[in-house]
């Protein structure tokens, strides 16, 4: 049997990287009333180059229609571009109260799984 | 900053689980000529219950149309249901040669990232 298969792989040119955008606090879904903007960092991009033999065969099977995945739950045939570290984000609400939300924004990404 | 965020989470009723299917060797994309069937195990299902504060806000931002992800690279707002262990798969090719492919089939799954 193989190892845990969950260590971060260096993203490099694979496309998996940290991206950043200013977003309205109200769109974060935290329930805080605020008209402020915050910087939200997230991970996106491909991890195709980090695929295992299992992933390559899984992709082949899916492409050939030889695998019947459960409805609405297609298996993923490459590691996922996901945060490996996080940071808190702070902002001011409508009552001028300073709020801090832990582990809200990503600070590093990796191809996981 | 948070930790590595890549440890397997117990899948439980979250939907992420090991699934199994008999598949033709020729559909595995390995380049082997064989008319055999093999048992291929893979992971699929949801990891929604394993979401972090980051994931919940990412899902909210995507749902509100407040985030502009790069084209063709939508960020993933939940951990991924991925193999955490693998096993070899063996079969006979058309020349009656016994072939073994390492780490081809999953033996355990987890919500990674």
């Amino acid at each position: 049997a193989g190892g845990p298969g969950s260590r971060p792989r260096a993203a490099g040119a694979r496309g998996c990287r940290l991206r950043s955008q200013l977003v309205p606090v109200r769109a974060l879904g935290l329930g805080h009333r605020s008209d402020e903007l915050v910087r939200f960092r997230f991970c996106s991009g491909s991890c195709r180059r980090a695929r295992s033999p299992h992933d390559l065969s899984l992709a082949s099977l899916l492409g050939a229609g030889a695998l019947r995945p459960p409805p609405g739950s297609r298996p993923i045939s490459q590691p996922c571009c996901r945060p490996t570290r996080y940071e808190a984000v702070s902002f001011m609400d409508v009552n001028s109260t300073w709020r801090t939300v832990d582990r809200l924004s990503a600070t590093a990404c990796g191809c996981l799984g | 900053a948070g930790g590595p965020g890549s440890r397997p989470r117990a899948a439980g009723a979250r939907g992420c689980r090991l699934r199994s299917q008999l598949v033709p060797v020729r559909a595995l994309g390995l380049g082997h000529r064989s008319d055999e069937l093999v048992r291929f195990r893979f992971c699929s299902g949801s990891c929604r219950r394993a979401r972090s504060p980051h994931d919940l806000s990412l899902a909210s931002l995507l749902g509100a149309g407040a985030l502009r992800p790069p084209p063709g690279s939508r960020p993933i707002s939940q951990p991924c249901c991925r193999p955490t262990r693998y096993e070899a798969v063996s079969f006979m090719d058309v020349n009656s040669t016994w072939r073994t492919v390492d780490r081809l089939s999953a033996t355990a799954c987890g919500c990674l990232g």
Epitope: P24, L37, V38, R39, S90, M92, S96, W98, T107 | -
Partner: antibody, heavy 122, light 107 residues
Framework: EVQLVESGGDLVQPGGSLKLSCAAS????????MHWVRQASGKGLEWVGR??????????EYGASVKGRFTISRDDSKNTAYLQMNSLKIEDTAVYYC?????????????WGQGTMVTVSS | DIQMTQSPSSLSASVGDRVTITCRAS??????LNWYQQKPGKAPNLLIY???TLESGVPSRFSGSGSGTDFTLTISSLQPEDFEIYYC?????????FGQGTKVEIK
């Protein structure tokens, strides 16, 4: 739409004064720091100064070339920041940009105004 | 004050070329380094935040790297709209300071 609009730029004589305004719309900037950056024609970017938010007691800092002559203020109720420029010199001639810097572990010039031209000439 | 030195001050390149601009800080600034693009008559626009984070809406051909004192902005395949001026900027210490700029021109 999130934007900053500067106003107040003008032609002024050396030694004169001018007050620039920067109005934010589409968001509230009370939690953010407000900076001013200037750029002389054909030259690079120069940081002028900043005013921090209420949490930091509206602390101000200035670049060496304007310290003691320029004053930054803000009115959060009006979503507006100001740059009061006194004892103006010919070398203060530039496009002046107001910039919002949202709170973060690492800060950047996040939202820029379109700039307003200040010309100091006799 | 922290001095930021960009090189080259200008460069000539063709569409499709790979272009690298470097920025050196006079002291260590960790990853408190941002990159901006400025078009004529316009305000600068943030491209890369915190040394390597791509700002949303910025094409993936732009990338940033480095930490400490040495930083790099790379454009993997130059496009016609990329022929502009680029600035690095540190936010490690007040006063925040910029590099002198790099003008990318058509060869």
């Amino acid at each position: 739409e999130v934007q900053l609009v500067e106003s107040g730029g003008d032609l002024v004589q050396p030694g004169g004064s001018l007050k620039l305004s920067c109005a934010a719309s589409g968001f509230t900037f009370s939690g953010s720091a407000m900076h001013w950056v200037r750029q002389a024609s054909g030259k690079g970017l120069e940081w002028v100064g900043r005013i921090r938010n209420k949490v930091h007691r509206y602390a101000t800092e200035y670049g060496a070339s304007v310290k003691g002559r320029f004053t930054i203020s803000r009115d959060d109720s009006k979503n507006t920041a100001y740059l009061q420029m006194n004892s103006l010199k010919i070398e203060d001639t530039a496009v002046y940009y107001c910039v919002v810097v949202v709170p973060g572990s690492i800060e950047a010039f996040d939202i820029w105004g379109q700039g307003t031209m200040v010309t100091v000439s006799s | 004050d922290i001095q930021m030195t960009q090189s080259p001050s200008s460069l000539s390149a063709s569409v499709g070329d790979r272009v690298t601009i470097t920025c050196r800080a006079s002291q260590s600034i960790s990853t408190y380094l941002n990159w901006y693009q400025q078009k004529p008559g316009k305000a600068p626009n943030l491209l890369i935040y915190a040394a390597s984070t791509l700002e949303s809406g910025v094409p993936s051909r732009f990338s940033g790297s480095g930490s400490g004192t040495d930083f790099t902005l790379t454009i993997s395949s130059l496009q016609p709209e990329d022929f502009e001026i680029y600035y690095c900027q540190q936010s490690y210490n007040i006063p925040w300071t910029f590099g002198q700029g790099t003008k990318v021109e058509i060869k």
